[in-house]
Interface confidence: medium
Amino acid sequence: QGHLVHMTVVSGSNVTLNISESLPENYKQLTWFYTFDQKIVEWDSRKSKYFESKFKGRVRLDPQSGALYISKVQKEDNSTYIMRVLKKTGNEQEWKIKLQVLDPVPKPVIKIEKIEDMDDNCYLKLSCVIPGESVNYTWYGDKRPFPKELQNSVLETTLMPHNYSRCYTCQVSNSVSSKNGTVCLSPPCTLARS
């Protein structure tokens, strides 16, 4: 009981929910559930029955492997899916798959909050703006990654002349996609173009 597998996929893709092991031999019944109690499909006596649900027309069951194919998944399909198998002995066995559907991240826009000469160095404060998403940020100065301490939506740093970069890139990523935004400065410390 309680085999839990995590899956993360991009919205709009086709997904196969399956287990890594073989199904019990000559099982009597196989049912896929969505959020514990909503049946999606049930196989019984050599035929599949698809239930009225938001998946109707988007799912297909392979009784041989137990795999459930879902087409064009959306964020609303985030859930724990349960495959329950009734063995010939009358015992039940179940497998759980936690599906996370993520939208591809949008292209970020870099906003220059502040840029100024400071003690012959260059003070920079840049923000990486994207619509409210849970993402990871990585900043690069001329392709050199900044340290982990700086990996959030705002890059705030004071650069010495030997560390100046011409272009600064913010890479936003989640587990299914990644996009970059770049801003370039005229050395040593003025805006060039976006």
């Epitope: 400071m118 003070y123 301490e149 705030e156 004071t158 560390n163």
Partner: antibody, heavy 118, light 108 residues
């Protein structure tokens, strides 16, 4: 000339608290990340904590997380380290240091000694 | 975290000698983000080298750094009396910043 002067060290009992200060001069304090690094007697250097120039971001070594708080007052050009639930292993000279491009530490203050003992 | 191991632990030398200190990282230090510091008794550390090989402002040219990946070296071409101290390497390629345990250069 860049100068960093630490103060606030002393003898404290285990479980006690202490606040260290670092007065900065000779540079635009609010534009630079600052850090605390410590050195136990006769031992090597250990990074403790970091704060961004604006004070908006802070980071801690696992050994002090939840017990130490770094903060700064840019109007007073001063960096602080508030330490609570002190342990014997926190005994060290505590240095404040200016971060150069979030990379290396340059320069350092002269240090202030913290002794945790019953 | 990246562990830095310095060797030897102590070196006993005479003024005028050439010194080579080693710093080995447990994993590759990205883009040679390695610094060397000098610390004399009762004093704060002082930056000598950054970026594995660039001398900090005001550091005499008898100090030089080299290396990349996991192996780095600090060389003092000719020891002066004021060079007897403890030397630390520090990586800043990944968080947390870590230091080596130090090498003591003492007078023979």
């Amino acid at each position: 000339e860049v100068q960093l002067v630490e103060s606030g060290g002393g003898l404290v009992h285990p479980g006690g608290s202490l606040r260290l200060s670092c007065a900065a001069s000779g540079f635009t304090f609010g534009g630079y990340a600052m850090s605390w690094v410590r050195q136990a007697p006769g031992k090597g250097l250990e990074w403790v904590s970091l704060i961004s120039g604006s004070g908006g971001s802070t980071y801690y070594a696992d050994s002090v997380k939840g017990r130490f708080t770094i903060f700064r007052d840019n109007s007073k050009n001063t960096l602080y380290l508030q330490m609570i639930s002190l342990r014997a292993e926190d005994s060290a000279v505590y240095y404040c240091a200016k971060y150069s491009n979030y990379d290396y530490f340059d320069p350092w203050g002269q240090g202030t000694l913290v002794t945790v003992s019953s | 975290e990246i562990v830095l191991t310095q060797s030897p632990g102590t070196l006993s030398l005479s003024p005028g000698e050439r010194v080579t200190l080693s710093c080995r990282a447990s994993q590759s230090v990205s883009s040679s983000y390695l610094a060397w510091y000098q610390q004399k008794p009762g004093q704060a550390p002082r930056l000598l080298i950054y970026g594995a090989s660039s001398r900090a402002t005001g550091i005499p040219d008898r100090f030089s750094g080299s290396g990349s990946g996991t192996d780095f070296t600090l060389t003092i071409s000719r020891l002066e009396p004021e060079d007897f101290a403890v030397y630390y390497c520090q990586q800043y390629g990944s968080s947390p910043r870590t230091f080596g345990q130090g090498t003591k250069v003492e007078i023979k």
